[in-house]
Interface confidence: low
């Protein structure tokens, strides 16, 4: 007869490992007992369990509660055992020794490999600001055994670098994603992808990019200067900009205080019926935590009385 086993048994941390040992004998042969031991190189054998054909399973104190026989029905020639809740310390060489009648003793070895799935963590880098050079956007670290693979999934253009730290029974892999920040990256996902033989599927952690910026400011409302004449109602100036974080707006008048009746409503400056006192230089000041911008315009309120041609035009238009 001969023993059937596996060269390597691979199990994920916390799962049960089946250590196979089956005696394929001639008819009439019987298995008296099967002894399981751990036999790592350089260390003495450590007994796990003894399967006796008459007395059943005896588990050594060091493995009490952790070694069982597979559930019934059982073949009397099957000396396989289950090692419950495998931990990484269980990784190593195991030997089954089978005593048969009348053929004698047989032994076989297998290696137990315990996979430790990683638990990845993603750490965002420093605040991203438009105008910076190559900057760390995020780093992703995963520790496991064997070493996990850490990659990035994103539409954003950038560069990656990885490093690995070997611990006594695991390896930690850190990958960094660097980019040159631009406003177009705002809201874009940056996903760390961790692969490992102990995972049923890749683990993914997504970080949403936030890039601080402030666009140039401009003022709308003066496109047709002829509309800015005495008596006009509903005249307004609107300040245009965009930024991250969203900017706040402030209006001032360069050549004096804002005229009475002028309303400031965020990015909009609303005028009462126009008079010549509304002429002047108006400044829109845009700011966020990242930067500030100014845009100024000159308002020149026309007096139709001073230009008969214009007055005629206005009359004919009415």
């Amino acid at each position: 007869g001969e023993l059937e086993t596996s060269d390597v048994v691979t199990v994920v941390l916390g799962q049960d490992a089946k250590l196979p040992c089956f005696y394929r004998g001639d008819s009439g042969e019987q298995v008296g007992q099967v002894a399981w031991a751990r036999v790592d190189a350089g260390e003495g054998a450590q007994e796990l369990a003894l399967l006796h054909s008459k007395y059943g399973l005896h588990v050594s104190p060091a493995y009490e509660g952790r070694v069982e026989q597979p559930p019934p029905p059982r073949n009397p020639l099957d000396g396989s055992v289950l090692l419950r809740n495998a931990v990484q310390a269980d990784e190593g060489e195991y030997e089954c020794r089978v005593s048969t009648f009348p053929a004698g003793s047989f032994q076989a070895r297998l290696r137990l490999r315990v996979l430790v799935p990683p638990l990845p963590s993603l750490n965002p880098g420093p605040a991203l600001e438009e105008g910076q050079g190559l900057t760390l956007a995020a780093s992703c670290t995963a520790e496991g055994s064997p070493a996990p693979s850490v990659t990035w999934d994103t539409e954003v253009k950038g560069t990656t670098s990885s490093r690995s730290f070997k611990h006594s029974r695991s390896a930690a892999v850190t990958s960094e994603f660097h980019l040159v920040p631009s406003r177009s990256m705002n809201g874009q996902p940056l996903t760390c992808v961790v692969s490992h033989p102990g995972l049923l599927q890749d683990q993914r952690i997504t970080h949403i990019l936030h890039v601080s910026f402030l666009a140039e400011a401009s003022v709308r409302g003066l496109e047709d200067q002829n509309l800015w004449h005495i008596g006009r109602e509903g005249a307004m100036l609107k300040c245009l900009s965009e930024g991250q974080p969203p900017p706040s707006y402030n209006w001032t008048r360069l050549d004096g205080p804002l005229p009475s009746g002028v309303r400031v409503d965020g990015d909009t400056l609303g005028f009462p019926p126009l008079t010549t006192e509304h002429s002047g230089i108006y400044v829109c000041h845009v700011s966020n935590e990242f930067s500030s911008r100014d845009s100024q315009v000159t308002v020149d309120v026309l007096d139709p009385q001073e230009d008969s041609g214009k007055q005629v035009d206005l009359v004919s238009a009415s």
Epitope: N85, V87, A89, V116, L119
Partner: antibody, heavy 122, light 107 residues
């Protein structure tokens, strides 16, 4: 019997330095990773640092990184913690602890010293 | 870092009571959890490792359970010497982190 005995604590001014020692006996010091854990007065436990058997890898809590250095001398069965640029918030009882490596790649702490008090005050 | 949250932060109980302390991890930590007991002025003592394994020499009235994010320490029949502070600790990732502690006091 496993024994861990810390020494080197005391009163030090902010910005000062101290070196803690932990003498191990009763087991094979070279086969276990070691940690320092601290406990501020009336507060909970905070892990500080770890060193592996052959000193190849050291880990630190963010709160002490760049200021504290863990080391070991396997020939003397001794663990050390060099503490520089000490702050008032470093005031605590500092324990050395043995890590139970034979269980998994993560480590619990199966033996602890009695602790040594470090007080940072002007 | 993984946050460990214990509840309750303190409890009052009588000798013979069954006491349960819970510990929740901010993310899954498999069974990489230990429980420690600390008495005033003393060093912590390991009670339970791997979430449910009893450390050698610890009385069998202490037991642990749970996996993933939710864990429990149970004292089946509280004894006078069990009045102490209990801490959970994850050691799945670096840095290892402790719960804030649960103080068990005499009612």
């Amino acid at each position: 019997e496993v024994q861990l005995v810390e020494s080197g604590g005391g009163l030090v001014q902010p910005g000062g330095s101290l070196r803690l020692s932990c003498a191990a006996s009763g087991y094979n010091f070279t086969t276990s990773a070691m940690s320092w854990v601290r406990q501020a007065p009336g507060k909970g436990l905070e892990w500080v640092s770890r060193i592996y058997q052959d000193s190849s890898t050291t880990d630190y809590a963010d709160s002490v990184k760049g200021r504290f250095t863990i080391s070991r001398d396997n020939s003397k069965n001794t663990l050390y913690l060099q503490m520089n640029s000490l702050r008032a918030e470093d005031t605590a009882v500092y324990y050395c602890a043995r890590q139970t490596e034979d269980r998994s790649y993560g480590y619990d702490l199966d033996y602890w010293g009695q602790g040594t008090l470090v007080t940072v005050s002007s | 870092d993984i946050q460990m949250t214990q509840s309750p932060s303190s409890l009052s109980a009588s000798v013979g009571d069954r006491v349960t302390i819970t510990c929740r991890a901010s993310q899954g930590i498999s069974s990489y959890l230990a429980w420690y007991q600390q008495k005033p002025g003393k060093a912590p003592k390991l009670l339970i490792y791997a979430a449910s394994s009893l450390q050698s020499g610890v009385p069998s009235r202490f037991s642990g359970s749970g996996s993933g994010t939710d864990f429990t320490l149970t004292i089946s029949s509280l004894q006078p010497e069990d009045f102490a502070t209990y801490y959970c600790q994850q050691h799945y990732t670096t840095p290892p982190t402790f719960g804030q502690g649960t103080k068990v006091e005499i009612k």
